[in-house]
Interface confidence: low
């Protein structure tokens, strides 16, 4: 599996040469260049940056660099009619209004085209009514409200704190509960780390800071008007009423200064327990409505944003493979930002830029990778992963036949504590082996490997002496490649100590304060963590593109399949009586997992022994490895989610950011005790077990000897 046998190269052109060429100072310089003005999707500034990157990638030495454009649905605030929320008295007078924009950070006071905080794709509307505080607006929060506390959100405006789950899931939950509007806010409990100053004196969120973000529930569809197909010049577009995933009620985000004003007057029920209390000096009463003296006051939303079909631009660079040019390893990350993008995405884009430069340097010295490497700068990720999804829809036939792997490259950092990796089990061994060869940037681990510091700081919950590697969820550009097309995918970045704070992001996420200075002053002054992430991402791409035998270990899939089968079985076993009544058995699934384990073991033995000098046999074995991920794809997709087609993994139906294993079975079992027709519900569980067992068995058979 060594990379040193790559084609047309002298021995110095190996992984080490590629890694040694990566420089922290260059990443720093690129980050500065990419963050001086906003690069919002669909704007002229972002088009100009696309052309700049195209030009520079050509200079770096790629064989070709093209722009791929699409016309997709985007969303913007109305420049002359701003969005805000008010408290109104019984006469309808506005006695309090929320901020119209964030106070700009020092040095940026004169920058134009900073989009004010808004929830992208919110419909227009001016609902008014009583407020209900719904905690994080998770499924379980609404269960608590409706089932335990008997609080009805129908016709109410709900206020939810950001964090824990994707904001689109919060809005969907609120809609299902009958709310007529949603206010999202950042609570200091989730976005203000104790002992750290707020920006510009530290990396915490100031009271006027606000998180932007889209509130779609696309479920992998891409452009809401052209699901399944590219939004090209001759596209047929749905009407807005038939668009995929758009919210039906107005939504708006605010900071914690404004949230304090809304929450301090709340009356009604007390919070059910301490997990509903944030860090503001307010009672966190649930409502509905304001307390005593303020009971006649209401909350009114004023939302005037518009949805517009707008042109976006991906940059696609190609470095042709010398031996297998029809096998593609893809490195992609987005370019569009909400404002300056100091972390999201430009800390990732700067790393991609330096990786392209290093590959280009090797190519100029006569080297080529064994397989083709594609580099992508995606547009409109923040508006629903639109650029990557449209490109993948346009090129799906090529990708499903030729796609070896996709490595994602959004934000390189969300902290500076340790490495974080989410990937297919096929890449576990690649990641382990690579990180054992890289130096740790962490203080106290001088001279030690990245693997060692990572394992120490983020140990695997299952395997002692190994680091945690998480499941892929969604919320980023790998989604279409992994969840729809079944291309082995992975992502890596440096993260915080996130034991207790999994999905809330870093404090300044999607705010105006996400600047170059935030990174350079507080997160990574030496850019050593960025360099490490460049080495991990770039090293994975190098090895995937250059190894004679693909660096995939199918035995690791066997291990997790057993774990996931155990987990879903134990969930089902919470209902032993129903399982008996409806004859629900997991035997077929466990049998399939057992078969997969045995076949994967035998395949791995053959992989060690076969004649690697025989190009036909080599290609055959590599194709079995490449197509294994593809074998987990169900062409019919998951129930009501046709673009989530991976049977082993899907984004959680309750949190897009999180991955769920055996999602079809999981969703069929979820809240099954509340279903009105238990026979039908358990029938669906049985059907999903059947689909999962068949898929695992079918995938196993792709690893059997071909004849």
């Amino acid at each position: 599996k060594s990379s040193n046998e790559a084609t047309n190269i002298t021995p110095k052109h190996n992984m080490k040469a590629f890694l040694d060429e990566l420089k922290a100072e260059n990443i720093k310089k690129f980050l500065y260049n990419f963050t001086q003005i906003p690069h919002l999707a669909g704007t002229e500034q972002n088009f100009q940056l696309a052309k700049q990157i195209q030009s520079q990638w050509k200079e770096f030495g790629l064989d070709s660099v093209e722009l791929a454009h699409y016309d997709v649905l985007l969303s913007y605030p109305n420049k002359t009619h701003p969005n805000y929320i008010s408290i109104i008295n019984e006469d309808g007078n506005e006695i309090f209004n929320t901020s119209l924009f964030e106070p700009p950070p020092p040095g940026y006071e004169n920058v134009s085209d900073i989009v004010p905080p808004f929830s992208a794709f919110s419909p227009q509307g001016m609902p008014e009514g009583d407020l209900v505080y719904v905690n994080y607006a998770r499924t379980e929060d609404f269960f608590k409200l409706e089932r335990d506390m008997k609080i009805n959100c129908s016709g109410k405006i709900v206020i939810a704190r950001y964090g824990k789950v994707f904001r689109g899931n919060k809005v969907k939950n609120a809609q299902l509960a009958g709310a007529k509007g949603v206010i999202l806010y950042s609570d200091p409990a989730d976005y203000f780390a104790p002992g750290v100053k707020s920006y510009p004196d530290g990396w915490n969120l100031p009271g006027g800071g606000v998180q932007r973000g889209n509130i779609l529930n696309l479920n992998g569809a891409g452009d809401p008007l052209t699901p399944g197909y590219p939004a090209n010049e001759y596209a047929y577009r749905r009407g807005i009423a038939e668009a995929v995933g758009l919210p039906s009620i107005p939504v708006h985000p605010i900071g914690y200064y404004d949230a304090q004003k809304l929450l301090e007057k709340m009356g009604g029920s007390a919070p059910p327990d301490s997990s509903w209390r944030g860090s503001l000096k307010v009672p966190y009463n649930v409502g509905p409505g304001f307390t005593g003296n303020f009971s006649t006051q209401k909350v009114k939303m004023h939302i005037h944003s518009t949805n517009e079909v707008t042109r976006i631009y991906n940059v696609i660079g190609t470095l042709r493979g010398a031996v297998e040019p029809d096998r593609y390893v893809i490195l992609g990350g987005h370019r569009d930002s909400w404002v300056f993008g100091g972390i999201d995405p430009q800390s990732g884009a700067a790393v991609v830029h330096e990786i392209v430069r290093s590959f280009g340097t090797l190519k100029k010295e006569g080297w080529r990778p064994r397989r083709t490497i594609l580099f992508a700068s995606w547009d409109a990720e923040e508006f629903g992963l639109l650029g990557s999804t449209e490109w993948a829809e346009e090129n799906s036939r090529l990708l499903q036949e030729r796609g070896v792997a996709y490595i994602n490259a959004d934000s390189s950092i969300e902290g500076n504590y340790t490495l974080r990796v989410d990937c297919t089990p096929l890449m576990y061994s690649l990641v382990h082996n690579l990180t054992k060869e890289l130096k740790s940037p962490d203080e106290g681990f001088e001279g030690k490997s990245l693997y060692e510091s990572w394992t120490k700081k983020s140990p695997s919950p299952e395997f002692s002496g190994m680091p945690r590697i998480s499941k892929l969820g969604s919320g980023n550009d790998f989604e279409v490649f992994f969840q729809r097309l079944g291309i082995a995918s992975g992502r890596a970045r440096y993260t915080k100590n996130w034991e207790t704070n999994k999905f809330s992001g870093y404090p300044l996420y999607h705010s105006v304060y996400e600047t170059y200075e935030l990174v350079e002053k507080f997160y990574d002054p030496m850019f050593k963590y960025h360099l490490t992430v460049a080495q991990v991402r770039g090293g994975m791409v190098f090895e995937l593109a250059n190894s004679i035998v693909l660096p995939f270990d199918c035995r690791d899939y066997a291990v997790v399949l057993r774990k996931y089968a155990d987990k879903i079985y134990s969930i089902s076993m919470k209902h032993p009586q129903e399982m008996k009544t409806y004859s629900v058995s997991f035997d077929s699934l466990f049998s399939a997992v057992k078969n997969f384990t045995e076949i994967a073991s035998k395949f791995s033995e053959r992989l060690q022994d076969f004649d690697k000098s025989n190009p036909i046999v080599l290609r055959m074995m590599n194709d079995q490895l490449m197509f294994l991920e593809r074998a987990f794809i169900d062409p019919l997709g998951l129930p009501d989610r046709p673009f989530y087609r991976h049977v082993i993994y899907a984004p959680s139906s309750h949190n897009k950011y999180a991955g769920e294993s055996f999602p079809g079975i999981y969703d069929a079992l979820f809240d099954i005790e509340s279903k009105v027709d238990p026979s039908k519900a358990w029938g669906e569980v049985k059907r999903q077990i059947y689909v999962a067992a068949f898929t695992v068995q079918a995938a196993a058979e792709t690893l059997s000897e071909v004849a």
Epitope: A565, M579, S583, D587
Partner: antibody
Framework: EVQLVESGGGLVQPGGSMRLSCAAS????????MAWVRQAPGKGLEWVAN????????YYADSLKGRFTISRDSSKNTLYLQMNSLRAEDTAVYYC?????????????WGQGTTVTVSS | DIQLTQSPSSLSASVGDRVTLTCRAS??????LHWYQQKPGKAPKLLIK???QSISGIPSRFSGSGLGTDFTLTISSVQPEDFATYYC?????????FGQGTKLEIK
């Protein structure tokens, strides 16, 4: 208290039959896979058989298939092992155990054992 | 069938010693390995599940490690009550099998 109590052991002639019982208490019997494990005198442990929560799936060590039958009666919270065509090499202490975690990975609760002696 | 081979078959140690018991599988069993302790005339007792996961009520001096084919059970400081026979067991594929045991004796 979670408890398993085996009974039914004793002396039997080669070729004879015997039925072992295991009474479960202190947990919801029908929620768990159950297993029989045996230990010949001075020897190690051998997993004999196990059964899923409702008795629809059973698994046996290859050497015992056709001679031994594992079954359960959830109304009585009892696990059984019917042993036919017994041989001298079946002489052992037979343990009943609760199999836990997903399918039937490991045994977290054991009975005290009942001795079966096959001899003429 | 998967064979589990434990070594050594017996081991003498003094109270306070650190001891390591080994279990080797004839093929990869991932992390599907568990450890039991058995005292004479008694039923086995579960010590460690899935290589390294601790069991409630089992002292923290017992720890496990390994993955694939090679596994170890370590007793960081042997206590008088630890002198017993230790068995590993795989649940990777049916039929489930035990190792032949390692007897820990007092020196």
């Amino acid at each position: 208290e979670v408890q398993l109590v085996e009974s039914g052991g004793g002396l039997v002639q080669p070729g004879g039959s015997m039925r072992l019982s295991c009474a479960a208490s202190g947990f919801t019997f029908s929620d768990y896979y159950m297993a029989w494990v045996r230990q010949a005198p001075g020897k190690g442990l051998e997993w004999v058989a196990n059964i899923n929560y409702d008795g629809t799936s059973t698994y046996y060590a290859d050497s015992l298939k056709g001679r031994f039958t594992i079954s359960r009666d959830s109304s009585k919270n009892t696990l059984y092992l019917q042993m036919n065509s017994l041989r001298a090499e079946d002489t052992a202490v037979y343990y009943c155990a609760r199999a836990l975690d997903g399918y039937y990975g490991y045994l977290d609760v054991w009975g005290q054992g009942t001795t079966v002696t096959v001899s003429s | 069938d998967i064979q589990l081979t434990q070594s050594p078959s017996s081991l003498s140690a003094s109270v306070g010693d650190r001891v390591t018991l080994t279990c080797r599988a004839s093929q990869s069993i991932s992390n599907n390995l568990h450890w039991y302790q058995q005292k004479p005339g008694k039923a086995p007792k579960l010590l460690i599940k899935y290589v390294s996961q601790s069991i409630s009520g089992i002292p923290s001096r017992f720890s496990g490690s390994g993955l694939g084919t090679d596994f170890t059970l370590t007793i960081s400081s042997v206590q008088p009550e630890d002198f017993a026979t230790y068995y590993c067991q795989q649940s990777n594929s049916w039929p489930y099998t035990f190792g032949q045991g390692t007897k820990l004796e007092i020196k």
